[in-house]
Amino acid sequence: QKSSIEKCSVDIQQSRNKTTERPGLLNCPIYWQQLREKCLLFSHTVNPWNNSLADCSTKESSLLLIRDKDELIHTQNLIRDKAILFWIGLNFSLSEKNWKWINGSFLNSNDLEIRGDAKENSCISISQTSVYSEYCSTEIRWICQKELTPVRNKVYPDS
């Protein structure tokens, strides 16, 4: 039995997958910040997790996915205010009793040190210094991401 949050996450991810393929993104759009091969958008307003998820989708992006501790630290370095929390694309899957990224993969327990409980209706937020489990209904800011298309150098044969 999937929770409403899980259903929302799956529905949005599926609808994103169904959309026609768009040309690769070479530069970050206005107001987005580049972090390595990603563009990040830090919201100014606050929303519960599922609205944040949906908002990123309307921007042809997703809630932030963090690959490892290194990426977490670099992302946290972009957060200017100490006390502010941002939703990322990770929530607790009741059916699998584990933290699950919105792309369907599970959290590697070594990647993030989460403060708080792993339980139903829990979603993950990050601050400048920490990673927290919060009720998904909590209204906080959020981070959307777009993947940049790597520019491969063309190799021309000798003329």
């Epitope: 206005i30 107001y31 830090f42 307003t45 309307t58």
Partner: antibody, heavy 117, light 110 residues
């Protein structure tokens, strides 16, 4: 280039509902938030509220009980309804793009609304 | 009465610098780095000049700069030009998705 155009009646009777629509051209409405701001003659600006294209709304607390906003992404339009208007609601009403929820980078030219019987 | 306090008027001669202040509280200006400034010429829509305290949109001359200290934000116009004569409004995010404006400052180029 993004352009916004307000439309609606220029005259509204007291106690009736003011209705305005903003049409967005030169870009998709979907990727941003959209706000309404008003300016009484010779006075300053007042933020009325914003709408996200997912349908979520945020309203100025002082106007919240009278304001309704909606969005139609298929028409690239968003709308404002302000009920129970009085002479104090007479103003130029602007629609604006609200990229992150704290500032406005594109504005309509404004729509003058007079409240009179 | 506006939530943010601005001086009603400011003036300067061409080439000079003028600073317009915008004073709020710890619940708006002091609490967030989300202050913006707008220029409005008579009969026209406002134009964004500064956002997020000090960022300038493309097309805005670098003569316009923004800063913040505590609960007060400032807009500085250096090298004043005749076309800078206009009304200037500050705005700030004010928590729980609210937003407030200042009362406006009429800038006169002498």
């Amino acid at each position: 280039q993004v352009q916004l155009q307000e439309s609606g009646p220029g005259l509204v009777k007291p106690s009736e509902t003011l209705s305005l629509t903003c049409t967005v051209s030169g870009g998709s409405i979907s990727s941003y938030y959209w706000s309404w701001i008003r300016q009484p003659a010779g006075k300053g600006l007042e933020w009325i509220g914003r709408i996200y294209t997912i349908g979520t709304t945020n309203y100025n607390p002082s106007l919240k009980s009278r304001v309704t906003m909606s969005v139609d992404t298929s028409k690239n339009q968003f709308s404002l309804k302000l009920s129970s208007v009085t002479a104090a609601d007479a103003a130029v009403y602007y629609c604006a793009r609200d990229p992150l929820g704290s500032f406005f980078d594109y504005w309509g030219q404004g729509s003058l609304v007079t409240v009179s019987s | 009465q506006s939530a943010l306090t601005q001086p009603p008027s400011a003036s300067g001669s061409p080439g000079q610098s003028v600073t317009i202040s915008c004073t709020g509280t710890s619940s708006d200006v002091g609490g967030y780095n989300y202050v913006s400034w707008y220029q409005q010429h008579p009969g026209k829509a406002p134009k964004l000049m500064i956002y997020e305290v000090s960022k300038r949109p493309s097309g805005v001359p670098d003569r316009f700069s923004g800063s913040k200290s505590g609960n007060t934000a400032s807009l500085t116009v250096s090298g004043l030009q005749a076309e800078d004569e206009a009304d200037y409004y500050c705005s700030s995010y004010a928590g729980i998705n609210n937003l407030v404006f200042g009362g406006g400052t009429k800038l006169t180029v002498l």
